[in-house]
């Protein structure tokens, strides 16, 4: 089995995690990509994902997570803004390739968030000016691909009923053209 390596990030509450996950350009440029948390016992869970197919350089915001897929450079940029202590954990970038398991992009990210703002802006936060709030929207990310419960045969898309609102409101700096991708619940 391949040894899974980790890269450790130690940040303070309120700061921004900013990571870049490289992928093979020709093969995966337009593939849908996701940011996952690794729960106890090697149980990955998707937290946010890009559109399907993934669009070039379009930031997708899901709660406090922002994903940007740079096709030209073969990298997925992931930002988690306004970090909380509870965000501490093990994360990974993956490329969706259903029906197979997602393809993991090395390395995994070991995030450690501690109390107390350091006084210096987190990465990608140049100043406290020009900060604008993105309020909770009425849409969510397009991560659920199939309806639930699912069958072996092709399942219908989720109905557009019962679309609810993500509950986090975030502060961002120098982020333009953020799109919200709807989820069909």
């Amino acid at each position: 089995a391949t040894k899974l390596t980790e890269e450790k990030y130690e940040l303070k509450e309120g700061q921004t995690l900013d990571v870049k996950c490289d992928y093979t350009l020709e093969k995966f440029a337009s593939s849908q990509k996701a940011w996952q948390i690794i729960r106890d016992g090697e149980m990955p869970k998707t937290l946010a994902c890009t559109e399907r197919p993934s669009k070039n350089s379009h930031p997708v915001q899901v709660g406090r997570i922002i994903l940007e897929d740079y096709h030209d450079h073969g990298l997925l940029r992931v930002r988690m803004v306004n970090l909380q202590v509870e965000d501490s954990g093990l994360y990974q970038c993956v490329i969706y390739q259903p029906p197979k398991e997602p393809h993991m992009l090395f390395d995994r990210i070991r995030l450690v968030v501690t109390k107390g703002f350091s006084g210096t802006p987190g990465s990608n936060e140049n100043s406290t000016q020009n900060v604008y709030k993105i309020p909770p929207t009425t849409t969510k990310a397009l991560c659920p691909l199939y309806t639930s419960p699912r069958t072996v045969t092709q399942a219908p898309p989720k109905s557009t009923a019962d679309v609810s609102t993500p509950d986090s409101e975030i502060n961002l700096t120098n982020v333009t053209d953020i799109i919200r991708v709807p989820v069909f619940n």
Epitope: G41, E101, P149, R150, P166
Partner: antibody, heavy 123, light 112 residues
Framework: QVQLVQSGAEVKKPGASVKVSCKAS????????MHWVRQAPGQGLEWMGI????????SYAQKFQGRVTMTRDTSTSTVYMELSSLRSEDTAVYYC????????????????WGQGTMVTVSS | DIVMTQSPLSLPVTPGEPASISCRSS???????????LDWYLQKPGQSPQLLIY???NRASGVPDRFSGSGSGTDFTLKISRVEAEDVGVYYC?????????FGGGTKVEIK
């Protein structure tokens, strides 16, 4: 349709072990996590652990560490929960439950439940 | 571990009337993605639990629209707009924000 069918009721003596099976059908078995939850008579629900049917990795509630073992057989789309060193307090209905979100989903509720297996521990 | 506290313990209801169940968690269930990892289940007498609401406020497939979930962070509510006789049973909230998954103690809904 999607369903989980569990093995029949068991009566065990204290100190013995029990192995409950849960056969999945109607979906891709290896794509969804499976959980085990138990319910003592007249009591609430208690989470025991989770297994990833794809790789077989597991995570158990602290309370059951060392006594519980969850395994799977991908050829028959079946997961198993074995509980050892049984005591009277382990008398309960044991449920397997599928986690709604697969690798590609955000949600993580238990959307499909087995019918339950009654395990009675009595001398 | 996250502790889930439900109230009331028992809820006598009149058919056609609204009902409300509260669930409180010892830690926030709001994830970085803006979703609250809180689900509601109904266990009817002699049956396995069934999913009603997931991610705090999303109705599961086939669940009547008289059921709704709300709340964020640590305080959540399940509402039944007009109780029907078939709604009797024990209602549980469950958090899946962090392992171990934990359930509330349950609220028994019965017809007056």
């Amino acid at each position: 349709q999607v369903q989980l069918v569990q093995s029949g009721a068991e009566v065990k003596k204290p100190g013995a072990s029990v192995k409950v099976s849960c056969k999945a059908s109607g979906y891709t078995f290896t794509s969804y996590y499976m959980h085990w939850v138990r319910q003592a008579p007249g009591q609430g629900l208690e989470w025991m652990g989770i297994i990833n049917p794809s790789g077989g990795s597991t995570s158990y509630a602290q309370k059951f560490q060392g006594r519980v073992t969850m395994t799977r057989d991908t050829s028959t789309s079946t997961v198993y929960m074995e509980l050892s060193s049984l005591r009277s307090e382990d008398t309960a209905v044991y449920y397997c439950a599928r986690e709604a979100g697969n690798y590609y989903d955000i949600e993580s509720a238990f959307d499909i439940w087995g019918q339950g297996t009654m395990v009675t521990v009595s001398s | 571990d996250i502790v889930m506290t439900q109230s009331p313990l028992s809820l006598p209801v009149t058919p056609g009337e609204p009902a409300s169940i509260s669930c409180r968690s010892s830690q926030s269930l709001l994830h970085s993605n803006g979703y609250n990892y809180l689900d509601w289940y109904l266990q009817k007498p002699g049956q396995s639990p069934q999913l009603l609401i997931y991610l705090g406020s999303n109705r599961a497939s086939g669940v009547p629209d008289r059921f709704s979930g709300s709340g964020s962070g640590t305080d959540f509510t399940l509402k039944i707009s007009r109780v029907e006789a078939e709604d009797v049973g024990v209602y549980y909230c469950m958090q899946s924000r962090n392992a171990p998954w934990t359930f509330g103690g349950g609220t028994k809904v019965e017809i007056k």
